[in-house]
């Protein structure tokens, strides 16, 4: 469960095409995507542009998740990870494509 969260819910893009900003995608209790960025000193980002995963701070309590899961019995099974299904509202405008890392030349890694 935690692994699924850490893998899918808090991705850093370590290698923006033009600067050293780290962009963070987190998802709040209402399923809204929150994008933020801060600058890192040069040299602190690996050349390989590894994707770093963080468990987001804004994940709801287990009681909230239970409520959401039980109340949502009419919602269809998602194609996303089960861990995400409990958190994400269907109107969340976030796709895995949008939170994939971007390499120095601006391309998505394969």
């Amino acid at each position: 469960f935690r692994k699924a969260f850490s893998t899918l819910l808090g991705c850093y893009r370590l290698c923006p095409a033009t600067n050293n900003a780290i962009e963070t995608v987190s998802i709040n209790n209402n399923g809204a995507a929150m994008f933020s960025s801060h600058h890192e000193p040069r040299g602190s980002i690996s050349k390989e542009c590894n994707l770093v995963y963080l468990i987001p701070h804004a994940v709801g309590s287990s009681e909230d998740l239970k409520k959401e899961e039980a109340a949502g019995i009419a919602r269809p099974l998602e194609k996303l990870s089960p861990a995400l299904s409990v958190i994400l509202d269907y109107d969340t405008d976030v796709s895995l494509e949008k939170i994939q890392p971007i390499t120095q030349n601006g391309q998505h890694p394969t």
């Epitope: 109340a71 009419a74 099974l77």
Partner: antibody, heavy 108, light 113 residues
Framework: QSVEESGGRLVKPGTPLTLTCTVS????????MGWFRQAPGKGLGWIGT?????TTYYARWAKGRFTISKTSTTVDLRISSPTTEDTATYFC?????WGPGTLVTVSS | AQVLTQTPASVSAAVGGTVTINCQAS????????LAWYQQKPGQRPKLLIY???KLASGVSSRFKGSGSGTQFTLTISDVQCDDAATYYC?????????????FGGGTEVVVK
């Protein structure tokens, strides 16, 4: 994904009955499943839900009369002491994945 | 306990016409949008049409449209076809800590002429 109910039959009032919902392609450790019923010629009713953690929730009218439990591939509904009012088609499912239903007839 | 009141109980529509079904909840559904619409034909399992009040389920015709929020919801069927003859149910999801987790409306029978 697929869901199929079984165990429906003719029972006498007061005779406990367990219905089984067998799922395929649904990870019950990740998703909730519900039990519903429909009396002949009547509307749909929600009986209860079991969520991924195993926590169960019941309709107020169903508490004490029905018990939901699960294994990795099945979700059971136990009717502790059926009455004639429990005669209905019982469905198991969630969202867009429901079984075809199983008919329970309670009659002496 | 929550009550979902569907109106009308029965409606007749001509092929090509439009049908509107209302579902009024006695209390707000979870997150104001945990409301689904199901279609059921005699002897068949219910089929999900709409979830989260307005989202079309996979494989469902865009002639079906859901709208509403909180306690008032509507299912609209446009360009009605013979195959739309069925009973339609709304299903609300609620905060289980203060109410039943789910409740159905009483159903609306759609007859197509």
């Amino acid at each position: 994904q697929s869901v199929e109910e079984s165990g429906g039959r003719l029972v006498k009032p007061g005779t406990p009955l367990t219905l089984t919902c067998t799922v395929s392609g649904i990870d019950l450790s990740s998703y909730a499943m519900g039990w519903f019923r429909q009396a002949p010629g009547k509307g749909l009713g929600w009986i209860g839900t079991i969520i991924s953690s195993g926590t169960t929730y019941y309709a107020r009218w169903a508490k004490g009369r029905f018990t939901i439990s699960k294994t990795s591939t099945t979700v059971d509904l136990r009717i502790s002491s059926p009455t004639t009012e429990d005669t209905a088609t019982y469905f198991c499912g969630r969202g867009d994945t429901w079984g075809p239903g199983t008919l329970v007839t309670v009659s002496s | 306990a929550q009550v979902l009141t569907q109106t009308p109980a029965s409606v007749s529509a001509a092929v090509g016409g439009t049908v509107t079904i209302n579902c009024q909840a006695s209390q707000s559904v979870y997150k104001n949008n945990y409301l689904a619409w199901y279609q059921q034909k005699p002897g068949q399992r219910p089929k999900l049409l709409i979830y989260d009040a307005s989202k079309l389920a996979s494989g469902v015709s865009s002639r079906f449209k859901g709208s509403g929020s909180g306690t008032q919801f509507t299912l609209t069927i446009s360009d009605v076809q013979c195959d739309d003859a069925a009973t339609y149910y709304c299903l609300g999801g609620y905060d289980c800590s203060s109410a039943d987790c789910s409740a159905f409306g009483g159903g609306t029978e759609v007859v197509v002429k």
